[in-house]
């Protein structure tokens, strides 16, 4: 740690005195203190000398000596009082700038330590301090206003009692700055804009901050626009607003608009896009396939995206058949606005019934005309199966009818014993019918197919089963020949209720 000579914490001298302060360290040393006139600074090897041969009240202050090369950063200090009967205060600053909630040191240094008992802090022109001003005094450093507030930004004077009268210092202006958390907050409205050529448009760029020192500008395709600025102050924030008014837009007004605001903390920007079109437009689209297949009893949401300008004058969902003239319930139709010019319309179809298959159309209208988007909804069904015994061209034939969607595949099984359903251990023979005859195949309906199995003689202790399956499920029908005549068994599980 450096050593100061004279080795006293405080030194009191009279004006005009010669003062020499020597600092000695292991390495090079440096003096630091308030900038004040008349000091001469010179080095002599590992010592540094601070001297004046004509001390004035302005030399009052704390002088610190440091060793820049010392990693521990040790220092020594001495406080000098230049005791001037005419000047009780040495004011080191015209202005003090702090952030809110910091301590503000008003550097009125007392030139005579004896005066400490009679000091006070006042506002200029003898006005008292504001209520709740919490302050303390140090003869070495001055008055400290603790946790300074913005409202305490005032002009202050330090007062000392000398011979029964108050002697004031020159004034010190305290500037308490609001803590700026970051760049100004920005809004640019609208977020997106579409206009038909010749229409009017308005774009508003506004920025706000707790501090008045910030700049804001609006630019179009990287060109700064010259727009008069409106300023305001409310909710403890400064606001600056730029409003671009266009009476009749043209294609050159289209493009990217950016609102940019900056302060000492940095820059914020936000952008929007302005589209100028020749005429009204209305576009319908869907991310879904327009041809939908859903299993009966399940639900489906049909979604349509609408892009339109000007806004929609009307819209609705319509069921176009073929099963009934019912219309979708309005409560199942939902509209959400993604932004000003894009909307999503959803039709919810829960627990679909057979009569609800068919075409659903979304219709929308704006000044640009009508547009429609149609979905085709086909229901999927598991196969239903029935078997009968008949004679075709004199031959005994088992006839299997299977109905479902998608079109079912048919397999015949012959197994030993009488059973409702053949299991693997009983199977004697299997026939696949790759091409069953299609009896009916209409849009939105089930597909009915027929498969024939010619049997020369029915074995009485055996079962003939027709199985049909598709992507939804399977169905079967067991045919058991008995002496009194053929007997058929639909399987227990075939109790289908849509």
């Amino acid at each position: 740690i450096p050593v100061i000579e004279p080795s006293v914490p405080e030194l009191v001298v009279k004006p005009g005195a010669t003062v020499t302060l020597r600092c000695v360290g292991n390495g090079s040393v440096e003096w630091d203190g308030p900038p004040s006139p008349h000091w001469t600074l010179y080095s002599d090897g590992s010592s540094s000398i601070l001297s004046t041969n004509n001390a004035t009240f302005q030399n009052t202050g704390t002088y610190r000596c440091t060793e820049p090369g010392d990693p521990l950063g040790g220092s020594a200090a001495i406080h000098l009082y230049v005791k001037d009967p005419a000047r009780p205060w040495n004011v080191l600053a015209q202005e003090v700038v702090v952030f809110e909630d910091q301590d503000a040191l008003l550097p009125c240094l007392l030139t005579d330590p004896v005066l400490e008992a009679g000091v006070s802090l006042v506002r200029v022109r003898g006005r008292p301090l504001m209520r709740h001003t919490n302050y303390s005094f140090s003869p070495w450093h001055g008055f400290t206003i603790h946790r300074a507030k913005f409202i305490q930004s005032q002009d202050y004077q330090c007062s000392a009692l000398m011979g029964g009268r108050k002697v004031m210092s020159i004034s010190i202006r305290l500037k308490v700055q609001k803590v700026i958390p970051g760049p100004p907050a920005l809004t640019l409205v609208p977020a997106e804009l579409v206009r038909i050529r010749g229409e009017a448009a308005q774009i508003v760029c506004s920025a706000s901050s707790v501090d008045v020192n910030f700049d804001v500008f609006l630019q179009h395709n990287n060109t700064k626009l010259a727009i008069p600025q409106q300023s305001d102050f409310h909710n403890n924030r400064y606001q600056k607003v730029l409003t671009l008014n266009l009476d009749q837009v043209d294609f050159q007004h289209a493009g990217n608009y950016s609102c940019v605001a900056s302060n000492v903390q940095g820059k914020h920007s936000t952008s929007m896009f302005f589209r100028v079109v020749e005429s009204a437009y209305l576009n319908l689209s869907s991310e879904q396939n327009l041809i939908q297949e859903v299993t009966v009893g399940e639900g489906l949401n049909l979604k349509v995206m609408v892009e339109a300008y000007p806004g929609l004058q009307g819209f609705n969902w319509t069921y176009l058949g073929p099963f009934s003239d019912h219309q979708p319930e309005p409560k199942l139709a939902n509209a959400t606005t993604k932004d000003t010019y894009r909307h999503t319309f959803t039709l919810s179809l829960p627990r679909l019934k057979p009569s609800e298959a068919g075409r659903y159309s979304f219709l929308a209208r704006n000044p640009g005309g009508w547009r429609a988007l149609t979905f085709e909804l086909t229901l999927r069904y598991p196969p239903e199966v029935s078997v009968i015994w008949t004679f075709i061209n004199g031959s005994g034939t088992l006839l299997c009818a299977a109905s479902g969607y998608p079109q079912p595949n048919v397999t015949w099984l012959q197994c030993s014993g009488h059973t409702d359903r053949c299991d693997e251990a009983q199977v004697l023979q299997v026939w696949d019918d790759p091409y069953p005859e299609v009896l009916s195949q209409e849009p939105f309906h089930k597909v009915t197919v027929q498969s024939l199995l010619t049997v020369e003689t029915l074995e009485h202790n055996q079962t003939y089963e027709c199985r049909a399956h598709n992507s939804v499920g399977s169905g079967s029908w067991a045919f058991i020949p008995i002496s009194a005549g053929a007997h058929t068994h639909p399987p227990d599980e075939f109790l289908f209720t849509p």
Epitope: E30, W31, D32, G33, P34, P35, S36, P37, H38, W39, T40, L41, Y42, L50, Y63, R64, T66, L92, A93, Q94, E95, V96, V97, V98, Q102, A104, L105, P107, H141
Partner: antibody
């Protein structure tokens, strides 16, 4: 070794506020006093003002009404704001560390600020 | 207009001694110490002399300063080509309560 680096916009419009920041590295801002000095093209150096580490400031009387110098000890930075600028404020702006006898022992490289519309 | 007065230019040949003057008033040079700065082209000013005649470490002893009354001077002996630069004088001014500068002297090494 103490180093100072100025930063801020190089172009400012007339009547707007010039804002510069000086970042100090290699030493603490919590001692000495920290100055802004400028040099208009082809002219001499002009002292703008200083801030002492405690937040105390003194400004050149010719600029006092337009200047604010502030300190951010947490970032080891100090800042200059000069309001209502005109073309006469076009200059290279330097930040510098001041010693108690009025000498400036460390300087920033300087940043040219042009005031123009 | 600078508060301290310096000649706008000075010149000398290598090896020569050159002196640059700086004059002020009682409120600055007359009552406070003088500092000199060297500014090489495109660089920041560098403290060359402080407290009238003190050299910071690293400054060659070819550079010396002196003060008398309200005037000061900077002498460069054994002039070298790398000394070609602008030289500025400065002093604390009591009425300004801050430092004042000269207009700068451009030294050319011929």
């Amino acid at each position: 070794q103490v180093q100072l680096q100025e930063s801020g916009p190089g172009l400012v419009k007339p009547s707007e506020t010039l804002s510069l920041t000086c970042t100090v590295s290699g030493g603490s801002i919590s001692s000495y006093y920290w100055n802004w000095i400028r040099q208009p093209p082809g002219k001499g150096l002009e002292w703008i003002g200083y801030i002492y580490y405690s937040g105390s400031t003194n400004y050149n009387p010719s600029l006092k009404s337009r200047v604010t110098i502030s300190l951010d000890t947490s970032k080891n930075q100090f800042s200059l704001k000069l309001s209502s600028v005109t073309a006469a404020d076009t200059a290279v702006y330097h930040c510098a560390r001041g010693r108690l006898n009025g000498a400036f022992d460390y300087w920033g490289q300087g940043t040219l600020v042009t005031v123009s519309s | 207009q600078s508060v301290l007065t310096q000649p706008p230019s000075a010149s000398g040949t290598p090896g020569q001694r050159v002196t640059i003057s700086c004059s002020g008033s009682s409120s600055n040079i007359g009552s406070n110490t003088v500092n000199w700065y060297q500014q090489l082209p495109g660089t920041a000013p560098k403290l060359l002399i402080y407290s009238n005649n003190q050299r910071p470490s690293g400054v060659p002893d070819r550079f010396s300063g002196s003060k008398s009354g309200t005037s000061a001077s900077l002498a460069i002996s054994g002039l070298q080509s790398e000394d070609e630069a602008d030289y500025d004088c400065a002093a604390w001014d009591d009425s300004l309560n801050g430092p004042v500068f000269g207009g700068g002297t451009k030294l050319t090494v011929l």
